[in-house]
Interface confidence: low
């Protein structure tokens, strides 16, 4: 009978160990091991036992002790398990960004290592346990899938091996993959909200609101808004789960018409859109022409209003007949007329809107100078030493200047408070006098003197 | 952090040649380097790769005609009776820590020329 | 045995352009596939890894996607600097299966 200690051996991949072989006679007449292994005999030995130092051992082997005794010839085999961790623990990438709600699979490759009956593989949640397969294969595949919340975002996962030889050599070896961080995002089914004029005048500024509710991470979300080729620059206002997006939109000429108004919300690899029309117009101020803005009374004076073909005008809040973008009406230039406003407004339907212009016109009329009873009394008796003030207003257009002199010389202070002498008594030649030419007017003051008793 | 090769130079076929590829600022127990070569105006080829804790792994066209060994600085490409077909410039890459993304190699040297010719 | 065959081997685009690289494995890698970029005389440069995860310091010009056999990279608004050789890479199994392997290149030349 032969015999070999250790039976059963596990060591490190690359390691040594020592082997009895002993016979059960004696002297045995051949006693030695057989092994592809590099081998060395550790001397001295005894009568009927050996010792070897087996080293490099890198695979899994059974060396087979054998002896030769006289009763026949014997052996026996040692188990000799090599062990070694994974060279490769990896997990598959994880997709740039996962749909909450969307089961996620994680996948994990893993190559070399053994004993495979001992090496198990785990995909982790951070330090949660997910999953727990055997290594099967070369490399190892293993996979599981998970659902995907909210809660998950920014989460590691990673996988990991454990080579378990606690029966044999009391230790447990782990090797762990690089973690993968998961993006998740949750964008709701429902389209953002888009509120902007339904209409836009060229060359005014507009102001467009896009926002949509129920987005995660909000923060992550990026909004596109754009006028037709005009791509838009928004303020983004963040709300716990929603987003308003806030920009000034200026249209030109050339793109007058209908144009689509683009408002996406993308967040991860997902996109929510909502259009909108938006009717670009131009409508300049109707024109308002006198034939002359300024002319001399009794004048006639042709007071015309003009606006876009579409349009339909009122002037001076008369509508034109037939309605329509032209109207004007004659007048006959009056004193009154002076400083007169001609008005006009302009309606015009864009899109179903009505949208409405004016322009105003002043008429500056010429007359005088006037010197009137009413206004320049030719007559006037004070008492002495009374206070008066003199009253004497010269009409017309331009204004004239006035002048109130006795003798050539002697001035009447009109619109001064004076105490009324004798001197002021007198016949006044009054003279208005403008650009336009010059009037007189005769004025008498005549002083009451008082009674003596 | 940077790696460079040495050792490359004409050969006669048959002979034997050993490329040295020496890195700095990082620990090769931690990384797993690999050898890519590449023939004049040709593509890349991966010939194979050295794990963080010594073991050697190679393409099935390079099993028996190259071997990868290390120490504490440097990864060895040896390359045993070598024919005109290995004229290349050999470059050392180096894969991710601790066996993770082994093959993707994301710092190389600038390489080092061998010319295989009698 | 396992192959990576990329089409095109060249391609030829102006400024400002855009160009897309096919790479075909020819069995699933999942998304085990990286890109590089090697310009004359230079070591090859990690561009894109995990088919369509952008390396530090990496141009987002660049746009690798793709999973299972089929992957593409694409070059958008090119620049002078973009002419180089491409090539993509798995790294799915072992090296005796597709650990490593690399595609046989595609010239991109700026015109």
């Known amino acids: 009978q032969t015999s070999v200690f250790p039976p059963e051996v596990i060591l490190p991949r690359g390691g040594s160990v020592k082997v009895n072989c002993s016979a059960s006679c004696d002297q045995p007449i051949s006693l030695g091991m057989e092994t592809p292994l590099p081998k060395k005999e550790i001397l001295p030995g005894g009568n009927n036992w050996k010792m070897y130092e087996l080293s490099n051992v890198q695979e899994d082997s059974q060396p087979m002790c054998y002896s030769n005794c006289p009763d026949g010839q014997s052996s026996a085999k040692t188990l000799l398990t090599v062990y070694w961790t994974p060279e490769r623990v990896e997990l598959a990438p994880l997709p740039p960004w996962q749909p909450v709600g969307k089961n996620l699979t994680l996948r994990c490759q893993v190559e070399g290592g053994a004993p495979r009956a001992n090496l198990t593989v785990m995909l982790l949640r951070g330090e949660k346990e997910l999953s727990r397969q055997s290594a099967v294969g070369e490399p190892a595949e293993v996979t599981t899938t998970v659902p995907v919340g909210r809660d998950d975002h920014g989460a590691n996962f990673s996988c990991r091996t454990e080579l378990d030889l606690r029966p044999y050599v009391l230790k447990l070896f782990e090797n762990t993959s690089a973690p993968h961080q998961l993006q998740t995002f949750d964008l709701p089914a429902t389209p953002p909200q888009l509120v902007s004029p339904q209409v836009l005048e060229v060359d005014t500024q507009g102001t467009v609101v896009c926002s949509l509710d129920g987005l995660f991470p909000v923060s992550e979300a990026q909004v596109s808004l754009a006028l037709g080729d005009q791509k838009l620059n928004p303020t983004i206002t963040y709300g716990n789960n929603s987003l308003s997006a806030k920009a000034s939109v200026k249209v030109t000429a050339e793109e007058e018409g209908t144009q689509q108004l683009l408002c996406g919300v993308m967040l991860g690899n997902q996109t929510q859109e909502t259009r909108q029309t938006v009717t670009i117009y131009s409508f300049p101020a109707p024109n308002v022409n006198l034939t002359k803005p300024e002319v001399s009374e009794g004048t006639e004076v042709i007071v015309e209003c003009e606006a876009h073909p579409r349009a339909k005008v009122m002037l001076n809040g008369v509508p034109a007949q037939p309605p329509g973008p032209r109207a004007q009406f004659l007048l006959k230039a009056t004193p009154e007329d002076n400083g007169r406003s001609f008005s006009c407004s302009a309606t015009l339907e864009v899109a179903g809107q009505l949208v409405h212009k004016n322009q105003t016109r002043e008429l500056r009329v010429l007359y005088g100078p006037r010197l009137d009873e009413k206004d320049c009394p030719g007559n006037w008796t004070w008492p002495e030493n009374s206070q008066q003030t003199p009253m004497c207003q010269a009409w017309g257009n331009p204004l004239p200047q006035l002048k109130c002199l006795k003798d050539g010389t002697f001035p009447l202070p009109i619109g001064q408070s004076v105490t009324v002498t004798r001197d002021l008594e007198g016949t006044y030649l009054c003279q208005a006098r403008s650009t336009r030419g010059e009037v007189t007017r005769e004025v008498t003051v005549n002083v009451l003197s008082p009674r003596y008793e | 952090q940077s790696l460079e090769e040495s050792g490359g130079r004409l050969v006669t076929p048959g002979g034997s040649l050993t490329l040295t590829c020496t890195v700095s600022?990082?620990?090769?127990?931690?990384?797993?380097m690999s050898w890519v070569r590449q023939a004049p105006g040709k593509g890349l080829e991966y010939i194979g790769w050295i794990s963080f804790s010594g073991s050697a792994y190679y393409a099935n066209w390079a099993k028996g005609r190259f071997t990868i060994s290390k120490t504490s600085t440097t990864v060895d490409l040896k390359i045993t009776s070598p024919t005109t077909e290995d004229t290349a410039t050999y470059f050392c890459?180096?894969?991710?820590?601790?066996?993770?993304?082994?093959?993707?190699?994301?710092?190389w040297g600038p390489g080092t020329l061998v010319t295989v010719s009698s | 045995a396992f192959e990576l065959t990329q089409t095109p081997s060249s391609v030829e685009a102006a400024v400002g352009g855009t160009v897309t690289i096919k790479c075909q494995a020819s069995e699933s890698i999942n998304s085990y596939l990286s890109w590089y970029q090697q310009k004359p005389g230079q070591p090859p440069k990690l561009l894109i890894y995990?088919?369509?995860t952008l390396a530090s310091g990496v141009s987002s010009r660049f746009k690798g996607s793709g999973s299972g056999t089929e992957f593409t990279l694409t070059i958008s608004d090119l620049e002078s600097a973009d002419a180089a050789t491409y090539y993509c890479?798995?790294?799915?199994?072992?090296?005796?299966?597709?650990?490593?392997?690399f595609g046989g290149g595609t010239e991109v030349v700026v015109k």
């Open positions: 600022g990082f620990s090769l127990s931690s990384y797993g």
């Open positions: 890459a180096r894969g991710g820590d601790y066996g993770g993304s082994t093959y993707i190699l994301n710092l």
């Open positions: 995990a088919a369509s």
């Open positions: 890479q798995s790294y799915s199994g072992t090296i005796s299966t597709s650990g490593g392997a």
